[in-house]
Amino acid sequence: KSSNEATNITPKHNMKAFLDELKAENIKKFLYNFTQIPHLAGTEQNFQLAKQIQSQWKEFGLDSVELAHYDVLLSYPNKTHPNYISIINEDGNEIFNTSLFEPPPPGYENVSDIVPPFSAFSPQGMPEGDLVYVNYARTEDFFKLERDMKINCSGKIVIARYGKVFRGNKVKNAQLAGAKGVILYSDPADYFAPGVKSYPDGWNLPGGGVQRGNILNLNGAGDPLTPGYPANEYAYRRGIAEAVGLPSIPVHPIGYYDAQKLLEKMGGSAPPDSSWRGSLKVPYNVGPGFTGNFSTQKVKMHIHSTNEVTRIYNVIGTLRGAVEPDRYVILGGHRDSWVFGGIDPQSGAAVVHEIVRSFGTLKKEGWRPRRTILFASWDAEEFGLLGSTEWAEENSRLLQERGVAYINADSSIEGNYTLRVDCTPLMYSLVHNLTKELKSPDEGFEGKSLYESWTKKSPSPEFSGMPRISKLGSGNDFEVFFQRLGIASGRARYTKNWETNKFSGYPLYHSVYETYELVEKFYDPMFKYHLTVAQVRGGMVFELANSIVLPFDCRDYAVVLRKYADKIYSISMKHPQEMKTYSVSFDSLFSAVKNFTEIASKFSERLQDFDKSNPIVLRMMNDQLMFLERAFIDPLGLPDRPFYRHVIYAPSSHNKYAGESFPGIYDALFDIESKVDPSKAWGEVKRQIYVAAFTVQAAAETLSEVA
């Protein structure tokens, strides 16, 4: 099981001692402490919190705790010139204005520095024009509008409801459709669960609540002005015109009270089907423009936000490994919040804090992990994963040589129904084995394992009797580690029942109402779900840092590679004639997957049989496991997305939050029937099959006997 080097605690008690030390009441106390004032990235308050965490991690017993600062592009509203949207009449008079701030929650009326709702990195502008309702502004929504309904968004202001996909993808789609502005709003259909009261009486979004968020399309670049390199003291910065991922049209978010005022007047085309209707008492007409009586009225946006290079601070704590100090297991989560961060991120940061405290307690008793554990409190995640990405860029050479695993620790909860895990297939067995050893916190599962309740409530769609484990996408700080550097990564949190609650995320996400009281009153009064998440995240880190043989199973990669190859082949076979015409063959990919399966199984056999007392052979086998994820990295990256380099997984081009398998082939096939040059398009499909097949085969060979 676990190593016993440099410790006075018996091996079988190591993990138990660590888990037993985790306390729900501590997590509760830390959450309260982290949520009393806003901690917006780039502000003095967040710098002070960084120093507090640094100090406390030192007290907890870490070997060293340092601040790592970077000067990155951030975005803020203009304090004297607020952002808003108005309806104007034919004379240009503003007859309706959206609210300038969210009504503060009870007890927080006198808190200063609450940033008003805004879309971070929106350019300045005051466009006016007719409104077009574009549903969720997904790729398929614009296809429906442009191709089926023949509605042209060019020169229009579009209004889109939040949900389903990352907001940056919505803005990108609107830009491509020719829109000159975007209004984002939260529809009760997506952010108001039936039968639950709105905050402060329940966990639903009130009509004045608004979701903040960045609208970048960074594709893994980090700081928009220093892609690929750290934003340090001597950085060369691009001009703003060359910055990566910035939107080109003004964008602003509103709540559903204000959205009602805009949508109730909509005219033009009726919604194409019921999937375009939300829950407001409006017709959900698509437009363009307002109906008869109001047809001369227009919508005008007033956006005055500014982009500013600002200093951010990561906190990096180190617990040196006793046996393999040059092998790093990283636990990281962000610290910056939009306002109070009751869930995002502080429910995660509080859990990390307690995990650090528990590890520190063991260290003070004479124990050390086998491998080095790095703890990170990232800054500016909300502005595009900037803190984690800049740090990884600065330390990329160390990380690619020494990085064993990265465990993410953002929000611990997005519900209180069951566990949710996204991770590399290498960690499937680790997660299964760990959750079988942990107690379920769920009602009705007393005395049962977490694995049991998780499997019952969230069964795998493909493999019966197993829990669902999802692909890693993006939208969080694991991105640079997994998608760019190829370090095995995973994340875990407690989630809602997706079957019965079809709203997107949790209703109060990124609003002023995401408070300590939201968690303590409505989500997890006993903090038992937080504790369970601490046990899962901490347990994973413990095993990854302490087990003699790394707890990675390459056979599970073989299983998913077969599944993904089958899936992408099936997509391609929707075009049998073109497959024939352009001689498109998947034989090379299927052959590579079979070879991977064969070699992975032989490696697993050797892993069971080798002499674990031989440190050289042990290190050699562990290195093959550690570097397997790295072997799926293509140094050239994906087409037009150089920082997404993992050939098996990438964030979906249509939704940053979602993971796509064989993304190069998938994107080459996407909407291929509409391409103007089919020969070129199918040539790209063939090239992507070649890249995928080569990469899988090359990865397989890293598992072969070394000589």
Partner: antibody
Framework: EVQLVESGGGLVQPGGSLRLSCAAS????????MSWVRQAPGKGLEWVSA????????YYADSVKGRFTISRDNSKNTLWLQMNSLRAEDTAVYYC??????????????WGQGTLVTVSS | QSVLTQPPSVSAAPGQKVTISCSGS????????VSWYQQLPGTAPKLLIY???KRPSGIPDRFSGSKSGTSATLGITGLQTGDEADYYC???????????FGGGTKLTVL
């Protein structure tokens, strides 16, 4: 030498249950996908179910989905097939088969001798 | 009804050559590897051909396999009376996520 020995077959009434076992030896059991394949009297081979190496991802033929459950215990080198809601058409010799390639089913290089399951009232 | 189609029976005299066809679709034979099994009367099946055309050790070179498009073929030359058996083709089906077999072909050596 690779050996697969099935047991647990017998006569059962329609709607009843039966659990088949397959004891494996002579290879690293956990590294290979294992399958159950059946053959009704006088008929051809029909693949029933498979379980991967690693965490044990499962696959089923449509004809048995929701009624049969495949499982394995790598520490005991044993494969199981739990058969519930049995029907007359499930009557067959059930073979345990080892995959030749690895963690997912490709082709079977070793087969057991089979165990007969008869579903009849 | 089997996903893969084989002729129910074939026959030939000793010393002759015989071929058994196996027809499928793009989602099975079209993209995946084909294997062939021999089942002598009263015994368990035995692997005869794998990866379309490879023979496990101990299988004589009288047995051969080939694949073209969505069809596969098993060839047996120099027929012997001991070759009388049922022969099955098998492969993975990428759409069904399942192993599929042909209905079997009974070989009679006259």
């Amino acid at each position: 030498e690779v050996q697969l020995v099935e047991s647990g077959g017998g006569l059962v009434q329609p709607g009843g249950s039966l659990r088949l076992s397959c004891a494996a030896s002579g290879f690293t059991f956990s590294s290979y996908a294992m399958s159950w394949v059946r053959q009704a009297p006088g008929k051809g081979l029909e693949w029933v179910s498979a379980i991967s190496g690693g965490i044990g991802s499962t696959y089923y033929a449509d004809s048995v989905k929701g009624r049969f459950t495949i499982s394995r215990d790598n520490s005991k080198n044993t494969l199981w097939l739990q058969m519930n809601s049995l029907r007359a058409e499930d009557t067959a010799v059930y073979y345990c088969a080892k995959d030749a390639v690895g963690a997912t089913p490709y082709y079977f290089d070793y087969w057991g001798q089979g165990t007969l399951v008869t579903v009849s009232s | 009804q089997s996903v893969l189609t084989q002729p129910p029976s074939v026959s030939a005299a000793p010393g002759q050559k015989v071929t058994i066809s196996c027809s499928g679709s793009s989602s099975n034979i079209g993209i995946n590897y084909v294997s062939w099994y021999q089942q002598l009367p009263g015994t368990a099946p035995k692997l005869l051909i794998y990866d379309n055309n490879k023979r496990p050790s101990g299988i004589p070179d009288r047995f051969s396999g080939s694949k073209s498009g969505t069809s596969a073929t098993l060839g047996i030359t120099g027929l012997q009376t001991g070759d009388e058996a049922d022969y099955y083709c098998g492969t993975w089906d990428s759409s069904l996520s399942a192993v599929v077999f042909g209905g079997g072909t009974k070989l009679t050596v006259l």
